[in-house]
């Protein structure tokens, strides 16, 4: 075993030597000799016995997407992207890995979930944890003070995910953010509007968007007697209230985080409250909370936000929830999280949340962390938790036993007799050139029944059948797969007829 490990190390070292010689542009003979040595070392390694025991699987917390799952995913993305574009967003992309330094100190307690890469020639790198910090880095690096952008990409977290609930270590985020100095709460309200539009369009069930403000939380902690140094850690405890009872949260704050029980009780009086604009009004009258500058600012902004949400017609979807304390260090103002609601067992019960499907908030200080002069660019944004949405949509389709098409083929070019491969190839090429999504079976003389069966399985709506008689007459038999009716279409009219039947625009503009 030790011998094998030594050989493996030698193979690695020799490989590095060969690469080094190539970079140094060493003599061809020397490179050739060192490559020959490398091959001899590899030959000595022989087959790895452990390879026989190797279980083929994807790494923990990851999955492949089958064509069926990809079809679902593309539909979901399509809804999201159309909404983002409707709201005037541009699109950007950033590297999948960032300098470790870029990500450090931005995520608080979640920093332990960042994937670090092994040293790649001097640069300490980490896989991105979200799309927000790279966005802030992008703004600072390019000295941008104003942009509305969306970004859809994979992010990585060393979580212990419950994949059945749509949680992964590699997953997509769909982010929309507005950066720039604007009048209070207008961009924030638009972000919430976008969130509601997307969740409604996806038809994944009833949802509720919880809203809070970091300043209200911080003010509340201050008046309850939490020391500054404990704010962030107590935040992460409070944020668990949607999953566990107040008693459990209190035990964690007192037992694990060293908070005095009376301080925890004072916090409990606040964080168990949720409601609408009336709760904002009520807290503005709170003798202690209204005396705290930060909390007062936050409450004032929330009051304004609710006005705009009413104008946008989504105030019925929003709940002011004092327990919402999203666990990311960079939020500075309004924070929000959308949860899907399960239908309660009995009428009169409160709807139950089944996990976050979208979230976001205001982060006015993040860009400043990257700017040498600390210049701030106010930002607000949202992130759609598409992995959870994919899971929900997939489950719904399975329950409905709905057939999902995994291709967009409009027509199969088929033949009824033998020796018509050339004609099929010519016709399919004509269709492709005209922008028609077409296929043919890769056989010289396929049976007509097999060709029709293929259409049934793949959900292809039309078959263009070539026969010797049709060739003589200059027509193509166009068959509807579902109704089985056939009509002869003049070859020159075929493209137009297919487009008409499949609802495709007549020109590829």
């Amino acid at each position: 075993m030790a011998e094998r490990a030594a050989l493996e190390e030698l193979v690695k070292l020799q490989g590095e030597r060969v690469r080094g010689l190539k970079q140094q542009k060493a003599s061809a003979e020397l490179i050739e000799e060192e490559v020959a040595k490398l091959l001899k070392l590899k030959a000595q390694l022989g087959p790895d016995e452990s390879k026989q025991k190797f279980v083929l699987k994807t790494p923990k917390g990851t999955r492949d997407y089958s064509p069926r799952q990809m079809a679902v995913r593309e539909k979901v993305f399509d809804v999201i992207i159309r909404c983002f574009k409707r709201h005037g967003a541009e699109v950007i992309d950033t590297p999948v890995f960032e300098l470790k330094e870029t990500l450090m100190g931005k995520y608080g307690e979640d920093s332990k979930l960042i994937y670090d890469l092994k040293d790649q020639g001097g640069e300490l790198l980490s896989l991105r944890y979200d799309l927000t910090v790279p966005f802030a880095r992008y703004l600072a690096m390019n000295k941008l003070t104003n942009i509305k952008r969306y970004h859809i990409a994979k992010v990585y977290r060393r979580d212990n995910p419950a994949m059945t609930r749509g949680r992964y270590r590699e997953f997509y985020q769909c982010d929309f953010d507005i950066a720039g100095n604007f009048d209070p709460m207008i961009p924030d309200a638009e972000c919430l509007k976008i969130m509601c539009e997307i969740l409604s369009s996806l038809q994944i069930g009833d949802f509720l968007v919880k809203v809070n403000d970091r300043r209200i939380l911080d003010g509340m902690f201050a008046i309850c007697g939490v020391s500054d140094s404990k704010f962030r850690t107590i935040c992460s405890s409070v944020d668990k209230l949607d999953k566990v009872s107040w008693e459990e949260v209190k035990n964690e704050m007192v037992g694990e985080k060293g908070l005095a029980p009376e301080v925890a009780d004072r916090i409990g009086d606040y964080v168990q409250q949720h409601g609408g604009v009336s709760l904002v009004e009520q807290l503005l009258q709170d003798p202690k909370l209204s005396q705290n500058k930060q909390a007062l600012e936050g409450l004032g902004d929330l009051k304004l936000l609710f006005e705009y949400l009413t104008l946008f017609g989504i105030d019925d979807k929003i709940s002011f929830d004092l327990s919402l304390a999203r666990g990311l260090d960079y939020y500075t103002g309004v924070i929000y999280e959308a949860v899907l609601l399960q239908t309660p067992a009995q009428a009169g019960e409160e709807p139950l949340g089944v996990g976050s499907v979208a979230a976001g908030g205001r982060y006015d200080g993040l860009v400043g962390m990257f700017d040498p002069k600390g210049r701030k660019v106010p930002c607000v944004g949202l992130s759609i938790g598409v992995e959870r949405i994919f899971s929900i949509v997939e489950q719904r389709l399975e329950a409905l036993e709905e057939k999902i098409r995994t291709t967009e083929t409009q027509v199969l070019v088929a033949s009824a007799q033998k020796k018509l491969l050339e004609e099929r190839l010519k016709l399919v090429s004509e269709l492709w050139d005209a922008g028609i999504k077409a296929e043919l079976l890769y056989k010289k003389n396929p049976k007509l029944l097999n060709q029709l069966q293929y259409c049934e399985e793949a959900g292809i709506p039309l078959v263009a059948i070539i026969g010797e008689q049709e060739l003589k007459d200059g027509v193509i038999k166009l068959r509807s797969v579902t109704s089985r009716e056939e009509v002869d279409v003049r070859r020159e009219d075929l493209v137009e007829e297919i487009k008409r039947r499949t609802g495709q625009p007549l020109c590829i503009c």
Partner: antibody, heavy 120, light 107 residues
């Protein structure tokens, strides 16, 4: 077990020639790079020359280049060092050595050495 | 050519002592380093290869470490049979060169 036995050493006058041989056994000789390493009396070790398994590649220390020739006969499991134009500074014990893992320039197995003395 | 410098050139120690010998390369050699032990009138014997791999049959009290330019050979607890001369050798590029040797003597 691996055995390397050198022969051919002796006393020779400056400018003279000698041919050292190394008989190998206990391993597949034709798989291995081989080398000659020498050690002057009371001094350190010096890598003189090496030859690849198929004789395609050879190399020499600057101090012997043009005067010494390394060769091998895989059929006879033998390694050779032809030494011409010998100098007093070539006086040393000459070791035949087998590479580590066939191609790694670290002498895993050594012969007992053969003494070459160049003196008038 | 790559120069290999060993230190110290000689060291006196007692049975049971921990001894460290260092070897410095004039330029980076990655892990391409070996350590040999030689006793008078005998051929050298390979102890450690590629900086830290123990040759089979060599007692575990011998260990090697380092990469780049600085390397060490450590004998954790000297035994009577360990008194000898030790050489390091770089196998990074030809001409392969040895250190001048470190003589380990009984105190």
């Amino acid at each position: 077990q691996v055995q390397l036995v050198e022969s051919g050493g002796g006393l020779v006058k400056p400018g003279g020639s000698l041919r050292l041989s190394c008989a190998a056994s206990g391993f597949t000789f034709s798989d291995y790079y081989m080398s000659w390493i020498r050690q002057a009396p009371g001094k350190g070790l010096e890598w003189v020359s090496y030859i690849s398994d198929s004789s395609r590649y050879t190399n020499y220390a600057d101090s012997v280049r043009g005067r010494f020739t390394i060769s091998r006969d895989n059929a006879k499991n033998s390694l050779y060092l032809q030494m011409n134009s010998l100098r007093a500074e070539d006086t040393a014990v000459y070791y035949c050595a087998r590479y580590l893992y066939q191609v790694i320039a670290i002498a895993k197995s050594w012969g007992q050495g053969t003494l070459v003395t160049v003196s008038s | 050519d790559i120069q290999m410098t060993q230190s110290p050139s000689s060291v006196s120690a007692s049975v049971g002592d921990r001894v460290t010998i260092t070897c410095r390369a004039s330029q980076g050699i990655s892990s391409w380093l070996a350590w040999f032990q030689q006793k008078p009138g005998k051929a050298p014997k390979l102890l450690i290869y590629v900086a830290s791999n123990l040759e089979s049959g060599v007692p575990s009290r011998f260990s090697g470490s380092g990469s780049g330019t600085d390397f060490t050979l450590t004998i954790s607890s000297l035994q009577p049979e360990d008194f000898a001369t030790y050489y390091c050798q770089q196998a990074n590029s030809f001409p392969y060169t040895f250190g001048q040797g470190t003589k380990l003597e009984i105190k």
